[in-house]
Interface confidence: medium
């Protein structure tokens, strides 16, 4: 699958030509001229995110299969690992290492040629959308964000679950339904099915030839790639019938023909009892299996289809993954089921996004339906915060009560803090702890979203087996807020690790903004901070200096912020005192580099901590960047 | 045939610590969550700690937070249980349980260790 | 946490009875209920999940029902190896157990 992140491995190599067949290298190659050393490389039809290096010698061509391995370094099967395709390349250059020759001369496409896009790429933005709007029920802003932000894992999900989607996948049906389907109406050479055969990811494909069903089976190996006995290994399903349609490799006959779905006709329909299906099914066409589905329907998670007996299923209608499994609250991600997204929490949208929750028009909320736990979940600088429960017309909702020290209730205050509260009620992202009232009682309380894995450095300071791509996402999870509030010309003001919240460990939420300003945190307030703790470190030298604060003030910290994350919950500065940090700043130096840190990510924090304000990005150049970090990391 | 067996129960001092290991065969262990539940004696059951099949999310009853850590290795087919700041109450039969994949029904189990916490 | 509360906790039966247990949660849990059923020095067994879906290889005589906070598992005809301790469990949010239901011979 050409994602993103693989395009941009190869896309730029002049001799890349993306999707093509072993034979369209091998054509490529005589076009060079077959001499020794004459290479290309193109895209891997069996395993995602891999490639192919054809190589010519001896007047032949022969074929390389380059494994993208999961820590996302390539490799030749029993060859040494590379950063990129490239480098494999450069380094066969030099070095034979197993190959048949050196590679000597790249065979460049011909001008006006594009890396060729698998059948696949053309789908799978559509899909992508789809299946975030059924499978959440998002829309708008919400939408997009979660397109953006799990853009890497919905690629994987979408491309390692396409063939529930496709025409010929009819589920888990027995092998005489599946002999009775394929042989309704036509019967050409070639027409097939594909029907999963049991809970542990093996399947049967079902192939017509001369008015005979043949089943073959498909595996999974312990690596989890698919294949029939003795055949070519594949990562997907669909990968593995897009090559057994131009080529039989061990089957009968090649592919021809897709057994349509029942009750689908051109469209894919995952619901409602079969129809017999005429005798006309969709043909293959020339731009492949894939390239021919047009809609698509997903059901929602939790949404109960059937409750048939556990083990022993039988299935009387083709419906979408017939034993997808029911999954309770808790366990969102249990079964063999794909990680949680931040989607699937409670917190993704706000509260108010159901429209029977009305959203009322005072920020403040009635004491009765609040109902605290005793335990403190933790102390900041504005207070206590304890876990609570709130009653809202719907459901009770589990949130954190932000309880403030005494001298918030100074009436000067009051005016202030319902100002700032009012605005801060208002602002909603699924990147930001959202405030769902104050109370006025025993002392002001904030009610905010919950998010149950605590601070950011705490949980990295406790947790050091998170992997740097872990972390790439959280605080691109953060530019992701920050930028939402750049655009609502709203300043956090306090922005540090310990300001970030996590809900699961690939989930973050910014938490505190405009507190400070609220609660008139001035200069004072920060001088009565204990030692050690002045915000000053995460200060930009113009708030420092002159007391300004601005988004572009929050991009500075959030340089520090970064820089916390990827020190697994260090303090910055250690043992320096605030006007030593500032000192440092003047004279242009920087904290150094976290070990480990990846140096795109230490480039950027600098970008970050650029002196001049003018100079500095904002949050939506910061967030592009990570972004495209974060897909390359990832993919 | 699914098989869950427990080992690594016995006698332990309050304070003490105690590392149960569950092996499983019979199925694809790296697809399913699995639990750990616990029975004292002549009481009912008691649901302590969860993990999830491939991402290792962890979930605990209240009253072993803290001290008791759930762990997986998809590798070696095994479920663990880490008990710290072991205390008289903690004392049961410790079952380990597979999270079936329908409504997370506990569909096997084993045969349970017994741990005592007694000085 | 939900609680589970089961009754009756201790019950007298004969074989051939039909006999039914409830359960309660103290919040909705829709249909995230299972029943298992313990005989002394054994470990529990799954009989219903969903509330009312029989786990494969349980006799037809077993049958659960409800959804929200009432569920019910009813045996239709008591058979001698019925005779055990049933407990009902909810995996709504983080599971908990009822405190079971001792089936005794009358």
């Known amino acids: 699958m050409a994602s993103s992140g693989m395009a941009d491995s190869a896309n730029h190599l002049p001799f890349f030509f993306g999707n093509i067949t072993r034979e369209e290298a091998e054509d490529y190659l005589v076009q060079g001229g077959m001499s020794d050393g004459l290479y290309l490389l193109r895209q891997s039809r069996n395993y995602l995110g891999g490639f192919a290096l054809s190589v010519a010698h001896g007047r032949k061509a022969h074929h390389y299969t380059i494994e993208r391995e999961l820590n996302g370094t390539y490799a030749i099967a029993g060859g040494r690992t590379h950063a990129s395709p490239a480098d494999l390349c450069h380094y066969h250059s030099q070095e034979s290492d197993g190959l048949v020759c050196l590679l000597k001369k790249p065979f460049n496409r011909p001008q006006g040629v594009q890396p060729k896009t698998g059948p696949f790429e053309d789908l799978k933005e559509n899909l992508i959308r789809e299946y975030v709007k059924q499978t959440w029920n998002l829309q708008g802003q919400a939408l997009e964000q979660a397109i953006i932000s799990q853009k890497p894992q919905l690629e994987k999900l979408i491309a390692t679950t396409a063939h529930e989607k496709m025409p010929w996948f009819h589920g888990k049906i027995s092998r005489e339904e599946s002999e009775q389907i394929v042989l309704i109406g036509s019967k050409t050479n070639g027409k097939f099915l594909i029907r999963a055969r049991d809970n542990n990811g093996s399947y049967a494909l079902c192939l017509l030839h001369e008015g005979k069903v043949l089943h073959y089976r498909i595996d999974k190996d312990k690596t989890g790639k698919l294949s029939i006995p003795e055949g070519k290994k594949f990562d997907t399903l669909w990968q593995l019938v897009e090559h057994y349609s131009y080529k039989a490799d061990g089957l009968l006959r090649v592919l021809t023909v897709p057994c349509q779905k029942i009750g689908t006709q051109g469209n894919v329909n995952f619901g409602g009892r079969p129809q017999l299906p005429g005798s006309h099914p969709a043909t293959w066409s020339a731009g492949g299996i894939i390239s021919r589905i047009k809609s698509y329907s997903f059901p929602k998670p939790g949404h109960r289809k059937s409750s048939p007996a556990q083990g022993n299923r039988q299935e009387s209608t083709v419906s979408f993954n017939p034993y997808e499994p029911e999954l309770a609250p808790w366990a969102a991600d249990k079964g063999p089921q794909r990680e949680a997204l931040p989607m699937d929490t409670e917190v993704y949208e706000s509260p108010y996004a159901d429209p029977e929750e009305i959203r009322p028009k005072e920020v403040y909320l009635d004491r009765k339906l609040l109902t605290l736990e005793d335990k403190e979940l933790g102390s900041g600088n504005f207070g206590t915060v304890k876990k609570g429960y709130y009653q809202m017309k719907k459901v009770v909702k589990t949130v954190a009560v932000k309880i403030l020290k005494n001298e918030a209730n100074d009436p000067a205050l009051k005016d202030e803090l319902l100002a700032e509260a009012n605005v801060m009620q208002q602002l909603d992202n699924p990147y930001i702890v959202r405030m769902i009232g104050i109370c006025e009682a025993e002392s002001w309380m904030l009610v905010m979203e919950m998010a149950e894995l605590g601070p950011l450095n705490k949980y990295l300071q406790q947790n050091r087996h998170v992997k740097d791509k872990n972390i790439i996402e959280l605080v691109h999870q953060v530019s992701m807020g920050m930028k939402y509030l750049e655009e609502s010309n709203f300043v956090h003001r306090d922005l540090a690790a310990r300001n970030v919240l996590l809900v699961t460990q690939h989930y973050a939420k910014i938490s505190d903004f405009g507190l400070s300003k609220a609660l008139r945190a001035d200069e004072n307030y920060y001088k009565a901070q204990t030692h050690g703790k002045w915000p000053v470190k995460w200060y930009a030298p113009e708030c420092i200096n002159y007391y300004k604060f601005s988004s572009k003030s929050d991009v500075w910290s959030f340089g520090v912020l970064m820089w916390e994350a990827f020190s697994y919950g260090q303090k910055p500065y250690r043992g320096m005192k605030g006007s030593e940090v500032t000192a440092m700043l003047e004279k242009g130096e920087r904290m150094g580099c976290p070990a480990g840190c990846p140096r795109e990510m230490y480039d950027l924090m600098n970008l970050c901590w650029t002196y001049d304000v003018e100079n500095r990005p904002g949050f939506a150049a910061v967030e592009l960047r990570l972004r495209n970090y974060y897909y390359d990391v990832v993919n | 045939e699914v098989q869950l067996l427990e080992s690594g129960g016995g006698l332990v001092q309050p304070g003490g610590s105690l590392r149960l290991s569950c092996a499983a065969s019979g199925f694809t262990f790296s697809s399913y969550a699995m639990s750990w539940v616990r029975q004292a004696p002549g009481k009912g059951l008691e649901w302590v700690s969860g993990?999830?099949?491939?991402?290792?999310?962890?979930y605990y009853a209240d009253s072993v937070k803290g001290r008791f850590t759930i762990s997986r290795d998809n590798s070696k087919n095994t479920l663990y249980l880490q008990m710290n700041s072991l205390r008289a109450e903690d004392t049961a039969v410790y079952y380990c349980?597979?999270?079936?994949?329908?409504?997370?029904?506990?569909?096997?189990w084993g045969q349970g260790t017994l741990v005592t916490v007694s000085s | 946490d939900i609680q589970m509360t089961q009754s009756p906790s201790s019950l007298s039966a004969s074989v051939g009875d039909r006999v039914t247990i409830t359960c309660r949660a103290s919040?909705?849990?829709?249909?995230?209920l299972n029943w298992y059923q313990q005989k002394p020095g054994k470990a529990p067994k799954l009989l219903i999940y969903a509330a009312s879906s029989l786990q494969s290889g349980v006799p037809s005589r077993f049958s659960g029902s409800g959804s929200g906070t009432d569920f019910t598992l009813t045996i239709s005809s008591l058979q001698p190896e019925d005779f055990a301790t049933y407990y009902c469990q909810q995996s709504s949010v983080l599971p908990t157990f009822g405190q079971g239901t001792k089936l005794e011979i009358k």
């Open positions: 919040q909705s849990i829709s249909s995230y």
């Open positions: 349980a597979r999270v079936g994949w329908y409504w997370n029904g506990l569909d096997y």
């Open positions: 993990i999830s099949s491939g991402y290792y999310y962890t």
